[in-house]
């Protein structure tokens, strides 16, 4: 049984599955939003499409105490090859430009759907 247990354990999640799950989580957030998401917190906007996962995580990780986006933060970290901590500022961000978390999540969902349709899973 011990040996068989090795075969039964799940392997790495394919990128397409991980992206689909992230999209589903964002759909969940946008559809179930009643009060302002994360109390209307603001995050840094992004002005480029390359390195988007890390940049998105760098923005969202600065929102603390918002359980609604904690799963999204964890999922995004799986797409970002380096460790991201609060306070990091990527060149992808638009300095002095912040947008509401709700809009950020909505826009992230739009972009990820495009990537999924185009087959860009990484």
């Amino acid at each position: 049984l011990t040996c068989l247990g090795g075969f039964a354990s799940p392997g790495p999640v394919p990128p397409s599955t991980a992206l689909r799950e992230l999209i589903e989580e964002l759909v969940n957030i946008t559809q179930n939003q009643k009060a302002p998401l994360c109390n209307g917190s603001m995050v840094w906007s992004i002005n480029l499409t390359a390195g988007m996962y890390c940049a998105a995580l760098e923005s969202l990780i600065n929102v603390s105490g918002c359980s609604a986006i904690e799963k999204t933060q964890r999922m995004l970290s799986g797409f970002c090859p380096h460790k991201v901590s609060a306070g990091q500022f990527s060149s992808l961000h638009v300095r002095d430009t912040k947008i509401e978390v709700a809009q950020f999540v909505k826009d992230l969902l739009l972009h990820l759907k495009k990537l999924f349709r185009e087959g860009q899973f990484n």
Partner: nanobody, 118 residues
Framework: GVQLLESGGGLVQPGGSLRLSCAAS????????MGWARQAPGKGLEWVSR????????YYADSVKGRFTISRDNSKNTLYLQMNSLRAEDTAVYYC???????????WGQGTLVTVSS
């Protein structure tokens, strides 16, 4: 909130040129397909041009092909429309807008008036 602010309109003589700009804020401009639409006096709304989010694919209405050029600068959150060889029939209010098929992603500017007259 989301804002799209057009500028660059005005009065120009036939054959002249204008460059319209649209400054975007409150959303992630770089991830949106964008476009320009226009409404001539007493006419309906007409899409003039669209550009994909990465800027590598553009579309033009037949009426402006070869005369108008759409472009974008994602680092500046700005959309442009270069209009050359202007004609009287190009007179209209020009609107900057998101060009997404996805419901709920429809944002429009207030418009800028372009008048082509001698």
């Amino acid at each position: 909130g989301v804002q799209l602010l057009e500028s660059g309109g005005g009065l120009v003589q036939p054959g002249g040129s204008l460059r319209l700009s649209c400054a975007a804020s409150g959303f992630i401009f770089a991830w949106y397909d964008m476009g320009w639409a226009r409404q001539a006096p007493g006419k309906g709304l007409e899409w003039v041009s669209r550009i994909t989010h990465h800027g590598n694919v553009t579309y033009y209405a037949d009426s402006v092909k070869g005369r108008f050029t759409i472009s974008r600068d994602n680092s500046k959150n700005t959309l442009y429309l270069q209009m050359n060889s202007l004609r009287a029939e190009d007179t209209a209010v020009y609107y900057c807008a998101t060009a997404e098929d996805e419901p709920g992603y429809d944002y429009w500017g207030q418009g800028t008036l372009v008048t082509v007259s001698s």
